[in-house]
């Protein structure tokens, strides 16, 4: 028998520095977690103690903090190289800055293979990107070899900016021939490493003949066997065992997100490459694990540029940006409109001639807007200003909801109106009219939404049975501020870009902004 240790991360999302327990900015260092310096300590400890160790990443290193905003992926290549990753799969967020924003900072600089079997380049890009990512790579490990085959969510064109010269194929259809190729090369131990979410990971384990282990990402799935060490609630045991169609037991793993845990899976193979046993658990990277001093020093060196960036002007406002709780928790506020407009703008994807865009709607809890921005400071808007407005380090995500769920959400928005509570929704691509004289749960008297399957966008009444795409904060997607119906009834959820980054990019693009209060949210006569 031959034993392999798989260490894995996924959805790190730019958390190079240690974070608080909820993966936001570290405040009390003695209680902070994760970060590449701490990760390196644990990885090195395991590499020294065990013979056959692979360190793998299942995608979405890009996007999530000011590190990515400033360094644009160079930080990912640098620190993943420093940690000596063995392979990485491309995630959807690796395309956030377009193909060039992937090629130059990451693909050309990474000293480890970057993989995806279901992304096929065409046209002029095919020769440009040739060899910079691979469908699979055979890794020598001790006296054996292990095949790693990559995959990426086929939804990437709707979630990011891969352009028109990359085709995202069905994962299972694309993976099978590559696994077959590995088999012809006499590689009998094969790991599928990818970024399509836990449901697809399980399908790959079930359907792709020859895959021995699946290491996934995208859905931020936390798996654990035994008593979990922090706040995350396990979605199942670690590893999650799938019985393949040809009768094999295939372990599937994922390690939550944000570098909070290091996935740790021990696999025992027989001489024919069959999995005999698999066991392990994610390792919580808490403060009991010291940060490696040399990596920490490097982090501090790279940090200097971030501090300078946060005070630079992004753009100007010529109007007061009203982000006060007195406005945003009671009525339409222009800061809410600005943020929603930025959220929609960030999700412009012309992937189908029938649609002007795949999504037109935005909702945003007023309680998430934490500060106004005064235009009387020469109109200057900085990252620092935006960090005061959006201090929680969240993301603006894409969900699919039925019209009936949206209606419930808007009822919840005003179910206890007047108490300055955070659930009051700011909107984009939506016209809502409330009648507060009616009883809670029946206060939405008009709800019109902007069409997407149209050449001239216009507002149509919401249809209860129709499925709509909506951009919203991850806080709402996870049922925050009492929006349990969103969490319970959403049909799809894809995590998006860092909130501040979305707004800062929009302001930089527009240069000068002047958002107005324009009648997106109305109250029917006599009730307000």
């Amino acid at each position: 028998a031959w034993e392999l240790t798989i260490l894995h991360t996924n959805d790190v999302h730019s958390r190079l520095e240690q974070t608080s327990e909820d993966s936001s900015k570290c405040v009390n260092a003695s209680r902070c977690m994760g970060g590449v310096a701490r990760l390196f300590t644990k990885v090195q400890q395991i590499r020294r103690a065990e013979p056959n160790v692979l360190l793998l990443d299942a995608g979405d290193q890009y996007q999530g903090t000011i590190w990515f905003t400033v360094y644009k992926g160079a930080e990912v290549a640098h620190f993943m190289n420093a940690l000596r990753y063995d392979a990485m799969a491309l995630g959807n967020h690796e395309f956030d800055n377009g193909v060039e924003g992937l090629i130059e900072p990451l693909l050309k600089e990474a000293k480890f293979p970057i993989l995806s079997a279901n992304i096929k380049a065409k046209g002029p890009l095919a020769s440009q990107i040739s060899g910079l990512y691979l469908p699979y790579k055979v890794l020598p490990v001790g006296d054996e070899v292990v095949g790693i085959v990559g995959y990426t969510s086929k939804e990437t064109p709707f979630l990011s900016n891969p352009g028109t010269n990359l085709v995202f194929e069905d994962e299972i259809t694309a993976l099978q021939p590559e696994v077959d190729k590995l088999k012809t090369l006499n590689v009998n131990k094969i790991i599928a490493l990818g970024h399509s979410g836990f449901e697809m990971d399980k399908l790959i384990a079930q359907k792709v003949r020859g895959v021995d282990v699946v290491v996934g990402g995208h859905s931020n799935t936390f798996l654990y066997t035994g008593n979990p060490p922090s706040k995350e609630v396990p979605a199942g045991k670690y590893p999650f065992i799938v019985t393949s169609d040809d009768g094999r037991k295939v372990p599937v793993v994922q390690a939550y997100a944000f570098g909070k845990y290091l996935g740790y899976l021990k696999i025992e193979f027989d001489e024919r490459g069959n999995v005999i046993s698999s066991h392990g658990n994610p390792i919580l990277l808490n403060s009991s694990i010291p940060e490696d001093p040399s990596i920490k020093a490097d982090i501090n060196k790279w940090r200097i540029k971030l501090d300078n960036y946060s005070t630079q002007e992004l753009g100007k406002t010529i109007v007061y940006l009203d982000g006060s709780s007195q406005s945003c928790r009671f009525r339409e506020c222009n800061m809410g409109n600005l943020i929603c407009d930025a959220m929609i703008n960030n999700n412009l994807r012309h992937t189908d001639e029938m649609f002007w865009n795949h999504v037109s709607m935005c909702i945003l809890n007023g309680g998430g807007i934490r500060s106004p921005i005064d235009e009387r400071n020469n109109g200057t808007i900085t990252w620092e200003n935006l960090a005061a407005v959006l201090p929680f380090g969240g993301t603006f995500d894409l969900v699919q909801l039925k019209g009936s769920t949206l209606k419930k959400a808007f009822e919840h928005s005003v179910h206890r109106y007047g108490q300055s509570t955070g659930e009051f929704l700011q909107v984009g691509g939506i016209h809502v009219v409330y009648d507060l004289s009616r009883k809670p749960g029946d206060r939405v008297v008009k709800l019109d939404v902007l069409c997407t399957k149209c050449r001239v966008p216009s507002y149509d009444p919401l249809k209860m049975d129709e499925v709509y795409k909506v951009i919203l904060p991850n806080f709402l997607a996870n049922g925050g501020d009492g929006f349990q119906m969103i969490k319970d009834e959403l049909l799809r959820h894809d995590s998006g870009d860092q909130d501040i980054n979305v707004v800062s990019t929009y302001i930089s693009k527009m240069k000068v902004i002047y958002p107005a209060v324009e009648g997106r949210i109305k109250f029917s006569t006599g009730s307000h």
């Epitope: 590499r47 190289n81 000596r84 063995d86 050309k108 000293k111 480890f112 293979p113 020769s127 440009q128 040739s130 060899g131 910079l132 691979l134 699979y136 790579k137 055979v138 890794l139 020598p140 070899v145 190729k181 012809t184 090369l185 006499n186 590689v187």
Partner: antibody, heavy 122, light 110 residues
């Protein structure tokens, strides 16, 4: 400036041993994989052996397996090739080369030493 | 004998475009990236192309690489007398668990 200074070549009888050294400077030696490549007189290049950044993984051409050992001393920035049971067909110029990467199997040889001649003859 | 083959010689006149081919198998070129090295007479080899088609800084854009399936090629346009050298392709081989060099091509500028 990257420099790879080689030493240890010479004339040796078949069956005997020789150790080649390659002193590296101008880069962080411990961050990169290293290789030995040889070239017999009038012939093409033949990769001989490679070693990962920390010495944890070593790779050999079939023609030298069991006879040659690649090693490194990261504290002294030096790469070695211990050649035992030498044969006439091992006669070649031996080049030390720096890998662009750390693993030894993924990357390219971006800097080369000038080479040292090893002649195996009775 | 080498598992990666190249034509032993190639030639062209100054200003011409020449192409050197490199043929391997699924375990080397088919699965891994290709690098090209130039060896001028009496000197050590020098990296010319890496990752199929990437040029290190200092290498003129007259040199370009490409890969398709289990074959690769090096193209030199606007041939110059100083391009007269031996050219080698190379790739990692997954079956041999080692690096393999092509047989080499001697380029003569007529």
């Amino acid at each position: 400036e990257v420099q790879l200074v080689q030493s240890g070549g010479g004339v040796v009888q078949p069956g005997r041993s020789l150790r080649l050294s390659c002193a590296a400077s101008g880069f962080r030696f411990s961050d990169f994989a290293m290789h030995w490549v040889r070239q017999a007189p009038g012939k093409g290049l033949e990769w001989v052996a490679g070693i990962s950044y920390d010495g944890g993984n070593k790779y050999y051409a079939d023609s030298v397996k069991g006879r040659f050992t690649i090693s490194r001393d990261n504290s002294n920035n030096t790469l070695y090739l211990q050649m035992n049971s030498l044969r006439a067909e091992d006669t070649a110029v031996y080049y030390c080369a720096k890998d662009h990467g750390y693993s030894g199997y993924y990357g390219h040889l971006d800097y080369w030493g000038r080479g040292t001649l090893v002649t195996v003859s009775s | 004998q080498s598992v990666v083959t190249q034509p032993p010689s190639a030639s062209g006149t100054p200003g011409q475009r020449v192409t050197i081919s490199c043929s391997g198998s699924s375990s080397n070129i088919g699965s891994n990236t290709v690098n090209w090295y130039q060896q001028l007479p009496g000197t050590a080899p020098k990296l010319l192309i890496y990752s199929n088609n990437q040029r290190p800084s200092g290498v003129p854009d007259r040199f370009s690489g490409s890969k398709s399936g289990t074959s690769a090629s090096l193209a030199i346009s606007g041939l110059q007398s100083e391009d007269e050298a031996d050219y080698y392709c190379a790739a990692w081989d997954d079956s041999l668990n080692g690096r393999v060099f092509g047989t080499g091509t001697k380029l003569t500028v007529l």
